[in-house]
Interface confidence: medium
């Protein structure tokens, strides 16, 4: 089938005191090969500081996955989610507050 770019959504949730968990979700993409990783100051974090979900079919002939990491509250601006899919890439910031969800459909 043709390439379908992912919808990327970054959320944040409270973790332990002074920390938050930031999660980057990519959904509705095809084919299934994708790079999704957290970056600090532009460089990728190591695998052992991130948690990945499996790349799973979402029932519409496309796929979804996620990556999460824990960061210090107040340092959100240093972190971005980097996505690469079918030769295209995009970078997504951490939203500034709990109620904010950033959606970005990459074209």
């Amino acid at each position: 089938g043709s390439t379908v770019p992912p919808m990327v959504n970054v959320t944040r949730s409270e973790a332990s005191e002074g920390n938050i968990t930031v999660t980057c979700r990519a959904s509705s993409f095809y084919p299934r090969n994708i790079i999704l990783t957290w970056r600090q100051d532009g460089v990728s974090l190591s695998h052992d500081t991130q948690q990945w979900g499996d790349v799973l079919p979402d029932g519409n002939g496309t796929y979804q996955t996620w990556v999460a990491t824990r960061i210090c509250r107040g340092e959100e601006q240093r972190f971005t989610c980097y996505m690469e899919h079918s030769g295209n890439h995009s970078t997504h910031p951490v939203p500034s507050g709990n109620s904010h969800h950033h959606h970005h459909h990459h074209h």
Epitope: Q40, D41, G42, V43, L45, S46, Q77, R78, H92
Partner: antibody
Framework: QGQMQQSGAELVKPGASVKLSCKTS????????ISWLKQKPGQSLEWIAW????????SYNQKFTAKAQLTVDTSSSTAYMQFSSLTTEDSAIYYC???????????????WGQGTLVTVSA | DVLMTQTPLSLPVSLGDQASLSCRSS???????????LEWYLQKPGQSPKLLIY???NRFSGVPDRFSGSGSGTDFTLKISRVEAEDLGVYYC?????????FGGGTKVEIK
């Protein structure tokens, strides 16, 4: 590699502000992190802050948080640094520099502008 | 902040000599991702600095192979195997592992 062309020398009075520019060409501006650095005559370098052109996100050296403000104009592929409440201690050459990242492989200041001399004098 | 200390302050050399520059950090500069972001820059009089070495030992594009970087933890070295006239200037080490990123005070390589 591309080019990074900085604005010309500035002579400013104490207490004033100055806005320096760094116009880029030859690379995809929005994919890049741009840092600003300070060098006083005959001294070493200090990192001031970076800005990610793709989102406008910034990270500052705490020493400069009240002094510097970084912005970008993606339409003209230009990065700016506004320096406020200037004192003679701010007299220096200010450089912009582009990071060169790929994954965990990083070169922080791979490509530099030519520098802008700021002189603060009454 | 991580303090970067360079020695010597000045290094007089003869052209063709080997030069060895030292850089010591006040704490371990391994990044959270496991890499050590230690870089070396050369600044010639009246010019902007130029990147020579990144990630301790990797030569940046266009940098001659007479430049080599080594070290780990807190102790790092830049070696120039045969100094040429174009190598004269001030060398700075830099750490990009911990914010705020910091430079050493510099080593001036000059003709003996």
């Amino acid at each position: 590699q591309g080019q990074m062309q900085q604005s010309g020398a500035e002579l400013v009075k104490p207490g004033a502000s100055v806005k320096l520019s760094c116009k880029t060409s030859g690379f995809t501006f929005s994919d890049n992190y741009i840092s600003w650095l300070k060098q006083k005559p005959g001294q070493s370098l200090e990192w001031i802050a970076w800005i990610y052109a793709g989102t406008g996100g910034t990270s500052y050296n705490q020493k400069f948080t009240a002094k510097a403000q970084l912005t970008v104009d993606t339409s003209s592929s230009t990065a700016y640094m506004q320096f406020s409440s200037l004192t003679t201690e701010d007299s220096a050459i200010y450089y912009c520099a582009r990071h060169d990242y790929y994954g965990t492989s990083g070169a922080w200041f791979a490509y530099w502008g030519q520098g802008t001399l700021v002189t603060v004098s009454a | 902040d991580v303090l970067m200390t360079q020695t010597p302050l000045s290094l007089p050399v003869s052209l063709g000599d080997q030069a060895s520059l030292s850089c010591r950090s006040s704490q371990n500069i391994v990044h959270i991702n496991g890499n050590t972001y230690l870089e070396w820059y050369l600044q010639k009089p009246g010019q902007s600095p130029k990147l020579l070495i990144y990630k301790v030992s990797n030569r940046f594009s266009g940098v001659p192979d007479r430049f080599s970087g080594s070290g780990s933890g807190t102790d790092f070295t830049l070696k120039i195997s045969r100094v040429e006239a174009e190598d004269l200037g001030v060398y700075y080490c830099f750490q990009g592992s911990h914010v705020p990123w910091t430079f050493g005070g510099g080593t001036k390589v000059e003709i003996k």
